[in-house]
Amino acid sequence: EDWQCPRTPYAASRDFDVKYVVPSFSAGGLVQAMVTYEGDRNESAVFVAIRNRLHVLGPDLKSVQSLATGPAGDPGCQTCAACGPGPHGPPGDTDTKVLVLDPALPALVSCGSSLQGRCFLHDLEPQGTAVHLAAPACLFSAHHNRPDDCPDCVASPLGTRVTVVEQGQASYFYVASSLDAAVAASFSPRSVSIRRLKADASGFAPGFVALSVLPKHLVSYSIEYVHSFHTGAFVYFLTVQPASVTDDPSALHTRLARLSATEPELGDYRELVLDCRFAPKRRRRGAPEGGQPYPVLRVAHSAPVGAQLATELSIAEGQEVLFGVFVTGKDGGPGVGPNSVVCAFPIDLLDTLIDEGVERCCESPVHPGLRRGLDFFQSPSFCPNPPGLEALSPNTSCRHFPLLVSSSFSRVDLFNGLLGPVQVTALYVTRLDNVTVAHMGTMDGRILQVELVRSLNYLLYVSNFSLGDSGQPVQRDVSRLGDHLLFASGDQVFQVPIQGPGCRHFLTCGRCLRAWHFMGCGWCGNMCGQQKECPGSWQQDHCP
C-alpha cells in the first residue's frame, strides 16, 4: 500500500491564539453608541458617543472633532447651549441613547438621557475625506412640550431604538423606548412612536402617532427594544418582553413588531413571537420535544444572504434574512446546551406569517376566542373587534388596529450547538462572494467570523481572535464603513476587515489554500499570509 502523509486534524490546522492588531480608537470612556457615515464623494466619518461627549473620527479612526454633550447644566456643555440660556432641566450626566443619521440633510441626530430625552441635530459638513459637525440645533420647543405630552421627548434613560425612514421629502423617526412608571411620568416618551422632524429643525411635529404601555402595566411589564431596522415596505423592532401581562414577568420571550414604512400610522402595527430552539441531532432522554427553547434575543442583524445559505433556507439568493443570537434567559447563564444559538428568519416568511395572522383575525369565519392581544398597549378584545369593543361598527375595519399574530415563527440553531460555551454579544452579517458570514463579538472580547451554514458538524471560521488584552465584552451595536466593521469594547472602537484580519492563524499550507477566496490567503515560505505581507514567494495554487 502506498505511503500517505499523515492527516492533520482539522482543529490542529489553525491557531486562534495568533495575535492580530487592528486599528483602534480610545474614546476615553465606555462607548455608548456608534454610527458611520459614507458620503457620495469619498468623505466618511465614524461618530462615537461616550458619557458627556461625542467624538467625530475620520475613516482612519483619527479624531477630527469632539463635542461636549454634558453634563446638563454645565457651562461647558456645547449641545445644551444650543437650547438657549437654561436651566432646561435637572443637572446631570448625558448618556447617549440615540445616535442616528438623517441622510437627506445629511445630519447626525443625537439624543441623551438628560434634558427630558431631547435630541440635537448636527448638520454634516464634508471637508476633504473627513466630515465635521456644524453647530448643533436643539430639537426642542419649550412651548410645545409638557410632561404629559412631549413630542420632543424622544430618548428614554432605560433605552431607545430609532430607525429613520425617508418618505417623500421628509424624515420620519420610528422610535421605540423602554419605559417604567417613573420615566413615563417624568417626560412621557412613548413605547412606540412615529415622529416627523419639523422643517425648521426646531423639534418634532406635535401630532405624532404612538402606542404606550398602559399605566396599570408599567410597573410589572417591561419591554426591552433590542434592535430596529428598515427593509422593504416596513420598519421592524425586535423586543424581549414578558410572555404574558398576567403571568410571571420573568418568563420572557422575543417578539418582532412590524410597522408600515410607507404610511406613518400605527393602525397596521403587528407583533409576532419569534421562537428559537436548539435541537441536537441526537435528542437526550428528557430533552424537550422540538428542542430546547432559547427565548431571549441578545443581538440581531438583517442582511441579504449568499447562494449556499439561501439554498439551505429554501429562499432565493440575495433575499433579506433576520439573524438573531438567542440565549436561555436574561443572564444568558449555562444550561444543558450551548450558551448562544443563532436562528435565521427570512423576512418574506415573517411577512407572510403576519399577513396570514391578520386574515385569521379579520376574515370570516373568525375562530371563536381568538384574541387581538397586545393587552399591555390596548384594551383586551376578541377578533375581529377593535380594542375594548364588543363588535365592529360599520365604519371601522378590523385591520386598522394593532394585532398580535396568534402563531409564532419557530426556527432551530443554524450552528447546531457548535458555539458551545461562547457568549455572543454582537452580530453583523455580510455576504462575501456567495458566502454568508456572521461577524460575532463575544463576552470575553473576541471576534469570531464564521460562515453561516447549517449542514456541518464543525464551524467554518474565517477568523477567531482577541480584540485586545482587556477581555471586555464586545458591545451590541456594530457599524460598517466600507470594507470594515467597527466593534466597540470597553472604551475602545476597533476596525475589523470584513474579509478577516489576516491568514496567519491557518497553520498548514493545505488549510491555507482552502481558505475562502475573499480572504486573499496564500502560502508564503512557511506561513499563511496575504500577498502584501509576503516579500518572497507567495503561492495560491499549490503547496510545496
Epitope: 457620495d40 440633510l105 417623500g168 421629502q169 416627523r196 422632524l197 401630532g207
Partner: antibody
Framework: QVQLQESGPGLVKPSETLSLTCTVS????????WNWIRKPPGKKLEYMGY???????YYNPSLKSRITISRDTSKNQYSLKLSSVTAADTAVYYC???????????WGQGTLVTVSS | DIVMTQSPLSLPVTPGEPASISCRAS??????????MNWYLQKPGQSPQLLIY???NQGSGVPDRFSGSGSGTDFTLKISRVEAEDVGVYYC?????????FGGGTKVEIK
C-alpha cells in the same frame, strides 16, 4: 450662496426629446432634493419631479411615462429628459432645491423651451 | 391631485397699507399637526422665491412684514405694510400629497 442654472435648447421639435441640465453651485446635490417645475403660458406652475441626495427619483404621475431625471455628482449637475414632446410641453422650465417637504428655497432663473416644428 | 384655488386673481395695493391673499385647498393639507402649505413670490423677470413654509414659518431672508396663517383647507398670506418691491405674482403650494400642486397665482400691483 446657492445658485442653480438651467441650460439646454430653447427649441425642440414635436415627438423629440427635451433635455435640460441644471448646474448647482454653493451646495452639493448629494444632500437634499433637486426638483424640476415648469410653467406653461397661461397655466399653473406644474411640479414635474425630483432626484434626491441618494439618487432616488419621484415623477409626477401625469408625466411618468415620458420623464427621466438623472444626475452627475462629479459635475454637481442634474438633468431632465422629457420624451415625445408636443406643443403642450412649451413652458418655462425651472430647477429648484428643497431641503424638506417640497419647500423650494432656491430656484434657477428658468429657461423657455418652445416645442414647434 | 389636490386643487389649489387662490383669490383674488389680481390685487391692487397702496404702499404702506396691509394686503392679504387667500388660498383654498380641495382637501385638508394638515397632518402630524403641521399644515403643508408654502407661499412663493415671483417678482417681474425673476424666478419664484420662498416666502413661507409649513403655513407660518418665514423663509430665510424674508422680511418680517410677510406672515402666513391658516390650517385645514383655508390659508392666508398677509403683508402688514406693502412696499413697492413686493409687486409680483404670489403662489400658494400644498406639499401634503404628491404631486405637490400650486395655486393659479395672485398678481399684486401698486394702485
Amino acid at each position: 450662496q446657492v445658485q442653480l442654472q438651467e441650460s439646454g435648447p430653447g427649441l425642440v421639435k414635436p415627438s423629440e426629446t427635451l433635455s435640460l441640465t441644471c448646474t448647482v453651485s454653493g451646495d452639493s446635490i448629494t444632500s437634499g432634493y433637486w426638483n424640476w417645475i415648469r410653467k406653461p403660458p397661461g397655466k399653473k406652475l406644474e411640479y414635474m419631479g425630483y432626484i434626491s441626495y441618494s439618487g432616488k427619483t419621484y415623477y409626477n404621475p401625469s408625466l411618468k411615462s415620458r420623464i427621466t431625471i438623472s444626475r452627475d455628482t462629479s459635475k454637481n449637475q442634474y438633468s431632465l429628459k422629457l420624451s415625445s414632446v408636443t406643443a403642450a410641453d412649451t413652458a418655462v422650465y425651472y430647477c429648484a432645491r428643497s431641503k424638506y417637504d417640497y419647500a423650494m428655497d432656491y430656484w434657477g432663473q428658468g429657461t423657455l423651451v418652445t416645442v414647434s416644428s | 391631485d389636490i386643487v389649489m384655488t387662490q383669490s383674488p386673481l389680481s390685487l391692487p395695493v397702496t404702499p404702506g397699507e396691509p394686503a392679504s391673499i387667500s388660498c383654498r385647498a380641495s382637501e385638508i393639507v394638515d397632518n402630524f399637526g403641521i399644515s403643508f402649505m408654502n407661499w412663493y413670490l415671483q417678482k417681474p423677470g425673476q424666478s419664484p422665491q420662498l416666502l413661507i413654509y409649513a403655513a407660518s414659518n418665514q423663509g430665510s431672508g424674508v422680511p418680517d412684514r410677510f406672515s402666513g396663517s391658516g390650517s385645514g383647507t383655508d390659508f392666508t398670506l398677509k403683508i402688514s405694510r406693502v412696499e413697492a418691491e413686493d409687486v409680483g405674482v404670489y403662489y400658494c403650494q400644498q406639499s401634503k400629497e404628491v404631486p405637490p400642486t400650486f395655486g393659479g397665482g395672485t398678481k399684486v400691483e401698486i394702485k
